[in-house]
Protein backbone atom coordinates (compact mmCIF):
# COMPACT_ATOMS: atom_id res chain seq x y z
CA UNK A 1 0.00 0.00 0.00
CA UNK A 2 1.11 3.57 -0.71
CA UNK A 3 2.42 5.60 2.24
CA UNK A 4 -0.06 8.22 3.46
CA UNK A 5 0.86 11.73 2.32
CA UNK A 6 1.73 14.09 5.17
CA UNK A 7 0.87 17.79 4.79
CA UNK A 8 1.88 19.76 2.89
CA UNK A 9 1.12 17.60 -0.16
CA UNK A 10 -0.01 18.41 -3.71
CA UNK A 11 -3.68 18.12 -4.58
CA UNK A 12 -4.80 18.21 -8.20
CA UNK A 13 -8.53 17.97 -7.47
CA UNK A 14 -8.62 20.67 -4.77
CA UNK A 15 -9.71 18.21 -2.08
CA UNK A 16 -7.82 16.88 0.91
CA UNK A 17 -7.86 13.42 2.48
CA UNK A 18 -8.87 14.59 5.95
CA UNK A 19 -11.42 17.37 5.54
CA UNK A 20 -11.62 17.98 9.29
CA UNK A 21 -7.89 18.41 9.92
CA UNK A 22 -6.62 19.59 6.54
CA UNK A 23 -7.53 22.34 4.08
CA UNK A 24 -6.75 23.15 0.44
CA UNK A 25 -4.41 26.09 -0.07
CA UNK A 26 -5.14 27.39 -3.62
CA UNK A 27 -2.08 29.59 -4.06
CA UNK A 28 0.27 26.60 -3.94
CA UNK A 29 -2.34 23.94 -4.82
CA UNK A 30 -1.49 21.93 -1.75
CA UNK A 31 -3.19 20.42 1.27
CA UNK A 32 -2.05 21.81 4.61
CA UNK A 33 -2.84 21.01 8.24
CA UNK A 34 -5.54 22.93 10.04
CA UNK A 35 -4.81 24.06 13.60
CA UNK A 36 -6.48 22.13 16.43
CA UNK A 37 -9.13 23.66 18.74
CA UNK A 38 -7.58 26.18 21.12
CA UNK A 39 -4.99 27.32 18.57
CA UNK A 40 -4.69 29.53 15.48
CA UNK A 41 -2.40 29.86 12.46
CA UNK A 42 0.75 31.75 13.41
CA UNK A 43 2.53 30.95 10.11
CA UNK A 44 0.81 29.82 6.91
CA UNK A 45 2.00 26.74 5.09
CA UNK A 46 4.17 26.67 2.00
CA UNK A 47 5.22 23.87 -0.38
CA UNK A 48 8.03 22.92 1.97
CA UNK A 49 6.62 23.77 5.41
CA UNK A 50 3.33 22.86 7.05
CA UNK A 51 1.07 25.25 8.98
CA UNK A 52 2.52 26.52 12.26
CA UNK A 53 -0.05 26.83 15.07
CA UNK A 54 0.03 28.79 18.30
CA UNK A 55 -2.14 28.64 21.42
CA UNK A 56 -4.98 31.14 21.74
CA UNK A 57 -4.21 33.91 24.22
CA UNK A 58 -6.16 34.28 27.44
CA UNK A 59 -9.77 35.35 26.92
CA UNK A 60 -9.94 33.98 23.36
CA UNK A 61 -10.84 30.67 21.73
CA UNK A 62 -11.21 28.64 18.55
CA UNK A 63 -13.68 25.78 18.84
CA UNK A 64 -12.84 23.72 15.74
CA UNK A 65 -9.95 22.57 13.59
CA UNK A 66 -9.27 25.78 11.69
CA UNK A 67 -7.01 27.85 9.48
CA UNK A 68 -7.89 31.14 11.15
CA UNK A 69 -5.15 33.67 11.76
CA UNK A 70 -6.82 34.92 14.96
CA UNK A 71 -8.76 33.49 17.89
CA UNK A 72 -12.30 34.62 18.70
CA UNK A 73 -12.75 36.89 21.71
CA UNK A 74 -14.59 35.32 24.66
CA UNK A 75 -17.85 37.12 25.38
CA UNK A 76 -19.96 36.91 28.53
CA UNK A 77 -23.62 35.89 28.39
CA UNK A 78 -25.81 39.00 28.26
CA UNK A 79 -27.97 39.26 31.41
CA UNK A 80 -29.95 42.11 29.81
CA UNK A 81 -31.09 39.57 27.21
CA UNK A 82 -32.11 37.16 29.97
CA UNK A 83 -29.11 34.86 29.58
CA UNK A 84 -27.00 33.26 32.30
CA UNK A 85 -23.74 31.35 32.14
CA UNK A 86 -23.58 27.60 32.62
CA UNK A 87 -19.93 27.11 31.64
CA UNK A 88 -16.99 29.46 31.14
CA UNK A 89 -15.15 30.24 27.95
CA UNK A 90 -11.96 28.22 27.47
CA UNK A 91 -9.40 28.27 24.65
CA UNK A 92 -11.42 25.48 22.98
CA UNK A 93 -15.03 26.66 23.47
CA UNK A 94 -17.11 29.82 23.72
CA UNK A 95 -19.00 30.78 26.86
CA UNK A 96 -22.00 28.48 27.30
CA UNK A 97 -25.25 30.34 27.97
CA UNK A 98 -28.86 29.47 28.76
CA UNK A 99 -32.04 31.35 29.59
CA UNK A 100 -32.36 32.42 33.21
CA UNK A 101 -34.89 30.47 35.33
CA UNK A 102 -38.48 31.39 34.44
CA UNK A 103 -37.52 32.44 30.91
CA UNK A 104 -37.50 30.84 27.44
CA UNK A 105 -35.54 31.46 24.25
CA UNK A 106 -37.44 33.91 22.06
CA UNK A 107 -34.72 34.58 19.45
CA UNK A 108 -32.37 31.99 17.99
CA UNK A 109 -29.47 32.63 15.61
CA UNK A 110 -27.19 29.57 15.79
CA UNK A 111 -27.58 30.01 19.54
CA UNK A 112 -30.06 31.74 21.82
CA UNK A 113 -29.68 35.51 21.68
CA UNK A 114 -32.74 36.69 23.61
CA UNK A 115 -34.91 35.21 26.37
CA UNK A 116 -38.37 36.28 27.52
CA UNK A 117 -40.45 35.54 30.60
CA UNK A 118 -42.45 32.32 30.48
CA UNK A 119 -46.21 32.84 30.25
CA UNK A 120 -48.33 32.10 33.31
CA UNK A 121 -50.52 29.03 33.26
CA UNK A 122 -53.96 29.88 34.65
CA UNK A 123 -55.61 28.05 37.55
CA UNK A 124 -56.65 24.53 36.58
CA UNK A 125 -53.62 24.09 34.30
CA UNK A 126 -49.86 23.51 34.45
CA UNK A 127 -46.96 23.88 32.05
CA UNK A 128 -46.31 20.78 29.98
CA UNK A 129 -42.91 19.38 30.91
CA UNK A 130 -40.31 19.94 28.20
CA UNK A 131 -37.26 17.87 27.31
CA UNK A 132 -35.02 20.94 27.52
CA UNK A 133 -35.56 23.81 29.94
CA UNK A 134 -35.69 27.26 28.32
CA UNK A 135 -36.34 25.97 24.78
CA UNK A 136 -39.85 27.33 24.29
CA UNK A 137 -42.69 29.18 25.96
CA UNK A 138 -45.10 27.37 28.28
CA UNK A 139 -47.78 25.19 26.79
CA UNK A 140 -50.45 24.98 29.47
CA UNK A 141 -52.33 21.70 29.83
CA UNK A 142 -55.32 20.96 32.11
CA UNK A 143 -54.70 19.25 35.43
CA UNK A 144 -55.39 15.53 35.18
CA UNK A 145 -58.34 14.04 37.06
CA UNK A 146 -57.98 14.21 40.83
CA UNK A 147 -55.52 17.13 40.71
CA UNK A 148 -55.78 20.93 41.07
CA UNK A 149 -53.73 24.10 40.60
CA UNK A 150 -55.10 27.33 42.10
CA UNK A 151 -52.68 30.08 40.97
CA UNK A 152 -51.58 31.90 37.81
CA UNK A 153 -47.96 30.84 37.57
CA UNK A 154 -45.35 29.84 34.97
CA UNK A 155 -44.09 26.99 37.14
CA UNK A 156 -46.76 25.79 39.61
CA UNK A 157 -47.57 22.08 39.29
CA UNK A 158 -50.97 20.42 39.67
CA UNK A 159 -51.26 18.77 43.10
CA UNK A 160 -53.41 15.76 44.06
CA UNK A 161 -56.68 16.54 45.82
CA UNK A 162 -56.62 16.06 49.58
CA UNK A 163 -58.16 12.71 50.61
CA UNK A 164 -60.28 13.67 53.60
CA UNK A 165 -60.57 10.11 54.88
CA UNK A 166 -56.75 9.90 55.27
CA UNK A 167 -57.08 12.59 57.96
CA UNK A 168 -60.16 11.16 59.66
CA UNK A 169 -62.36 13.80 57.99
CA UNK A 170 -65.20 13.72 55.51
CA UNK A 171 -65.64 15.58 52.23
CA UNK A 172 -67.62 18.79 52.48
CA UNK A 173 -67.08 19.86 48.87
CA UNK A 174 -65.37 17.98 46.04
CA UNK A 175 -62.15 19.24 44.53
CA UNK A 176 -62.06 20.79 41.08
CA UNK A 177 -59.24 21.46 38.65
CA UNK A 178 -58.86 24.86 40.33
CA UNK A 179 -59.47 24.03 43.99
CA UNK A 180 -58.69 21.38 46.56
CA UNK A 181 -61.24 19.16 48.24
CA UNK A 182 -62.89 20.81 51.25
CA UNK A 183 -62.89 18.56 54.30
CA UNK A 184 -64.87 18.76 57.55
CA UNK A 185 -65.06 17.01 60.88
CA UNK A 186 -67.60 14.17 60.50
CA UNK A 187 -69.40 15.35 63.66
CA UNK A 188 -69.83 18.99 62.64
CA UNK A 189 -72.00 20.55 59.95
CA UNK A 190 -70.17 23.02 57.71
CA UNK A 191 -71.22 26.62 58.51
CA UNK A 192 -72.09 28.43 55.23
CA UNK A 193 -69.61 31.25 55.80
CA UNK A 194 -66.63 28.86 56.19
CA UNK A 195 -64.97 27.85 52.94
CA UNK A 196 -61.45 26.93 54.10
CA UNK A 197 -59.85 23.82 52.74
CA UNK A 198 -59.22 22.18 56.12
CA UNK A 199 -61.65 22.58 58.97
CA UNK A 200 -60.64 20.79 62.15
Amino acid sequence: SQPQAVPPYASENQTCRDQEKEYYEPQHRICCSRCPPGTYVSAKCSRIRDTVCATCAENSYNEHWNYLTICQLCRPCDPVMGLEEIAPCTSKRKTQCRCQPGMFCAAWALECTHCELLSDCPPGTEAELKDEVGKGNNHCVPCKAGHFQNTSSPSARCQPHTRCENQGLVEAAPGTAQSDTTCKNPLEPLPPEMSGTMLM
Epitope: G38, E58, N59, P76, D78, P79, I86, P88, T90, S91
Partner: antibody, heavy 116, light 107 residues
Protein backbone atom coordinates in the same frame (compact mmCIF):
# COMPACT_ATOMS: atom_id res chain seq x y z
CA UNK B 1 2.26 41.78 36.08
CA UNK B 2 -1.17 40.77 37.31
CA UNK B 3 -1.73 41.53 41.00
CA UNK B 4 -4.76 41.15 43.26
CA UNK B 5 -4.45 43.02 46.56
CA UNK B 6 -7.04 42.18 49.20
CA UNK B 7 -8.13 44.19 52.24
CA UNK B 8 -6.98 43.32 55.77
CA UNK B 9 -8.42 40.93 58.36
CA UNK B 10 -11.86 41.55 59.83
CA UNK B 11 -13.26 40.72 63.28
CA UNK B 12 -17.06 41.01 63.23
CA UNK B 13 -19.95 40.17 65.52
CA UNK B 14 -22.56 37.49 64.73
CA UNK B 15 -25.47 38.90 62.73
CA UNK B 16 -23.41 41.77 61.32
CA UNK B 17 -22.19 42.29 57.74
CA UNK B 18 -18.70 42.78 56.34
CA UNK B 19 -17.35 44.05 53.02
CA UNK B 20 -13.96 42.95 51.76
CA UNK B 21 -12.14 44.29 48.73
CA UNK B 22 -9.82 43.07 45.98
CA UNK B 23 -7.87 45.69 44.01
CA UNK B 24 -6.69 44.52 40.61
CA UNK B 25 -3.69 45.82 38.67
CA UNK B 26 -1.53 44.80 35.72
CA UNK B 27 -4.37 43.97 33.31
CA UNK B 28 -7.62 45.36 31.87
CA UNK B 29 -9.99 45.02 34.81
CA UNK B 30 -13.20 45.06 32.74
CA UNK B 31 -12.41 42.09 30.48
CA UNK B 32 -11.76 39.29 32.98
CA UNK B 33 -13.99 37.54 35.49
CA UNK B 34 -13.10 37.92 39.16
CA UNK B 35 -14.08 35.03 41.38
CA UNK B 36 -14.32 34.62 45.14
CA UNK B 37 -13.35 31.44 46.97
CA UNK B 38 -13.90 30.49 50.63
CA UNK B 39 -11.53 28.39 52.73
CA UNK B 40 -12.40 27.43 56.28
CA UNK B 41 -9.50 26.53 58.61
CA UNK B 42 -8.15 23.10 57.79
CA UNK B 43 -10.79 22.60 55.11
CA UNK B 44 -11.03 22.66 51.34
CA UNK B 45 -11.90 25.42 48.89
CA UNK B 46 -15.44 26.49 47.99
CA UNK B 47 -16.35 28.59 44.98
CA UNK B 48 -18.67 31.48 45.90
CA UNK B 49 -19.26 33.16 42.54
CA UNK B 50 -17.91 35.62 40.01
CA UNK B 51 -18.36 39.19 38.90
CA UNK B 52 -17.69 40.41 35.37
CA UNK B 53 -16.61 44.04 35.81
CA UNK B 54 -17.36 44.86 32.17
CA UNK B 55 -21.10 44.79 32.84
CA UNK B 56 -20.94 44.48 36.65
CA UNK B 57 -22.99 41.28 36.41
CA UNK B 58 -22.49 38.61 39.07
CA UNK B 59 -23.31 34.93 39.18
CA UNK B 60 -23.36 32.88 42.39
CA UNK B 61 -23.00 29.37 43.67
CA UNK B 62 -26.56 28.50 44.82
CA UNK B 63 -25.13 27.81 48.29
CA UNK B 64 -24.00 31.45 48.70
CA UNK B 65 -27.06 33.23 47.27
CA UNK B 66 -28.34 35.59 49.96
CA UNK B 67 -25.06 35.32 51.87
CA UNK B 68 -22.61 36.97 49.46
CA UNK B 69 -23.12 40.04 47.25
CA UNK B 70 -20.46 40.78 44.62
CA UNK B 71 -19.91 44.26 43.22
CA UNK B 72 -17.18 46.08 41.31
CA UNK B 73 -16.01 49.64 40.83
CA UNK B 74 -14.47 50.11 37.38
CA UNK B 75 -12.93 53.50 38.21
CA UNK B 76 -10.73 52.02 40.95
CA UNK B 77 -10.39 48.51 39.43
CA UNK B 78 -11.68 47.07 42.69
CA UNK B 79 -14.06 44.18 43.32
CA UNK B 80 -15.98 43.83 46.56
CA UNK B 81 -17.73 41.03 48.39
CA UNK B 82 -20.27 41.75 51.09
CA UNK B 83 -21.18 38.94 53.49
CA UNK B 84 -24.37 39.38 55.51
CA UNK B 85 -26.01 37.85 58.61
CA UNK B 86 -22.67 36.46 59.72
CA UNK B 87 -22.38 33.31 61.82
CA UNK B 88 -19.41 31.27 63.01
CA UNK B 89 -19.77 29.21 59.79
CA UNK B 90 -18.66 32.30 57.87
CA UNK B 91 -15.33 32.49 59.73
CA UNK B 92 -12.86 31.72 56.95
CA UNK B 93 -10.22 33.03 54.60
CA UNK B 94 -11.74 34.56 51.47
CA UNK B 95 -9.70 34.75 48.28
CA UNK B 96 -10.34 36.67 45.09
CA UNK B 97 -8.96 35.09 41.93
CA UNK B 98 -8.86 35.97 38.25
CA UNK B 99 -9.95 33.16 35.97
CA UNK B 100 -8.77 31.68 32.73
CA UNK B 101 -8.93 27.88 32.52
CA UNK B 102 -8.80 27.73 36.28
CA UNK B 103 -7.45 30.44 38.55
CA UNK B 104 -3.93 31.46 37.49
CA UNK B 105 -3.94 34.55 39.73
CA UNK B 106 -4.98 34.76 43.40
CA UNK B 107 -5.18 37.50 46.01
CA UNK B 108 -3.38 36.94 49.31
CA UNK B 109 -6.65 36.24 51.13
CA UNK B 110 -8.71 38.10 53.73
CA UNK B 111 -9.38 36.46 57.10
CA UNK B 112 -12.88 37.04 58.45
CA UNK B 113 -13.46 36.04 62.08
CA UNK B 114 -17.01 36.03 63.43
CA UNK B 115 -17.03 36.25 67.23
CA UNK B 116 -19.03 37.96 69.94
CA UNK C 1 -22.92 19.78 41.22
CA UNK C 2 -19.83 17.92 40.03
CA UNK C 3 -18.00 16.24 42.91
CA UNK C 4 -14.20 16.10 42.70
CA UNK C 5 -12.91 13.26 44.87
CA UNK C 6 -9.33 13.15 46.14
CA UNK C 7 -9.43 9.85 47.98
CA UNK C 8 -6.01 10.20 49.63
CA UNK C 9 -6.03 12.86 52.34
CA UNK C 10 -2.33 12.34 53.12
CA UNK C 11 0.58 10.95 51.15
CA UNK C 12 4.02 10.28 52.54
CA UNK C 13 7.06 10.35 50.30
CA UNK C 14 10.83 10.87 50.41
CA UNK C 15 13.01 13.44 48.66
CA UNK C 16 13.86 12.12 45.18
CA UNK C 17 10.80 9.86 45.00
CA UNK C 18 7.93 9.96 42.52
CA UNK C 19 4.39 10.50 43.80
CA UNK C 20 0.99 10.59 42.08
CA UNK C 21 -1.99 12.52 43.46
CA UNK C 22 -5.30 11.39 41.97
CA UNK C 23 -8.63 13.13 41.48
CA UNK C 24 -11.90 11.68 40.21
CA UNK C 25 -14.81 13.74 38.81
CA UNK C 26 -18.39 12.55 39.32
CA UNK C 27 -19.11 13.24 35.64
CA UNK C 28 -17.19 13.91 32.44
CA UNK C 29 -15.37 17.27 32.60
CA UNK C 30 -13.26 16.80 29.47
CA UNK C 31 -9.83 18.28 30.17
CA UNK C 32 -11.20 21.24 32.12
CA UNK C 33 -9.25 20.53 35.28
CA UNK C 34 -6.66 22.60 37.14
CA UNK C 35 -4.25 21.66 39.94
CA UNK C 36 -3.10 23.94 42.77
CA UNK C 37 -0.42 23.77 45.42
CA UNK C 38 -1.09 25.46 48.77
CA UNK C 39 1.49 25.89 51.50
CA UNK C 40 0.44 26.80 55.08
CA UNK C 41 -0.53 30.48 55.40
CA UNK C 42 -0.34 31.08 51.65
CA UNK C 43 -2.74 31.43 48.73
CA UNK C 44 -3.13 28.50 46.36
CA UNK C 45 -0.62 28.52 43.51
CA UNK C 46 -1.60 27.40 40.00
CA UNK C 47 0.41 24.44 38.73
CA UNK C 48 -1.58 22.92 35.87
CA UNK C 49 -4.55 23.86 33.68
CA UNK C 50 -6.34 21.97 30.89
CA UNK C 51 -5.43 18.77 32.80
CA UNK C 52 -1.84 18.76 31.51
CA UNK C 53 -0.69 22.31 30.65
CA UNK C 54 2.05 23.40 33.04
CA UNK C 55 2.08 27.10 33.93
CA UNK C 56 5.29 28.98 33.17
CA UNK C 57 7.62 29.00 36.15
CA UNK C 58 6.31 25.67 37.44
CA UNK C 59 9.14 23.10 37.62
CA UNK C 60 8.91 20.36 35.00
CA UNK C 61 8.86 17.72 37.73
CA UNK C 62 5.13 18.53 38.01
CA UNK C 63 3.06 16.75 35.34
CA UNK C 64 -0.70 16.59 34.90
CA UNK C 65 -2.57 13.91 32.98
CA UNK C 66 -6.04 12.52 32.40
CA UNK C 67 -9.33 13.41 30.77
CA UNK C 68 -13.01 12.69 31.28
CA UNK C 69 -13.31 11.67 34.93
CA UNK C 70 -9.84 10.54 36.05
CA UNK C 71 -6.96 12.94 36.61
CA UNK C 72 -3.47 12.66 38.06
CA UNK C 73 -0.83 15.10 39.24
CA UNK C 74 2.58 13.43 39.23
CA UNK C 75 5.62 14.87 41.01
CA UNK C 76 8.88 13.22 39.99
CA UNK C 77 12.07 13.75 41.98
CA UNK C 78 10.15 15.19 44.96
CA UNK C 79 11.88 18.11 46.69
CA UNK C 80 11.49 19.28 50.29
CA UNK C 81 9.79 22.47 49.06
CA UNK C 82 6.98 20.34 47.59
CA UNK C 83 5.65 19.80 51.13
CA UNK C 84 2.17 21.25 50.66
CA UNK C 85 -1.48 20.46 50.06
CA UNK C 86 -2.60 19.80 46.49
CA UNK C 87 -6.11 20.53 45.19
CA UNK C 88 -7.78 19.65 41.91
CA UNK C 89 -10.57 21.81 40.49
CA UNK C 90 -13.03 21.41 37.63
CA UNK C 91 -13.95 24.48 35.59
CA UNK C 92 -16.09 22.61 33.06
CA UNK C 93 -19.44 23.84 34.41
CA UNK C 94 -20.75 26.06 37.19
CA UNK C 95 -20.56 25.82 40.09
CA UNK C 96 -16.81 25.29 39.98
CA UNK C 97 -15.82 22.61 42.47
CA UNK C 98 -12.58 21.59 44.16
CA UNK C 99 -11.26 18.33 45.50
CA UNK C 100 -10.89 18.12 49.29
CA UNK C 101 -7.09 18.21 49.04
CA UNK C 102 -4.15 15.82 49.45
CA UNK C 103 -1.41 16.74 51.93
CA UNK C 104 2.06 15.69 50.86
CA UNK C 105 4.36 14.80 53.76
CA UNK C 106 8.10 14.41 53.34
CA UNK C 107 9.60 11.51 55.34
Amino acid sequence: QVQLQQSGPELVKPGASVRISCKASGYTFTTYYLHWVKQRPGQGLEWIGWIYPGNVHAQYNEKFKGKATLTADKSSSTAYMQLSSLTSEDSAIYFCARSWEGFPYWGQGTTVTVSS
Amino acid sequence: DIVMTQSQKFMSTSVGDRVSVTCKASQNVGINVAWYQQKPGQSPKSLISSASYRYSGVPDRFTGSGSGTDFTLTITNVQSEDLAEYFCQQYDTYPFTFGSGTKLEIK
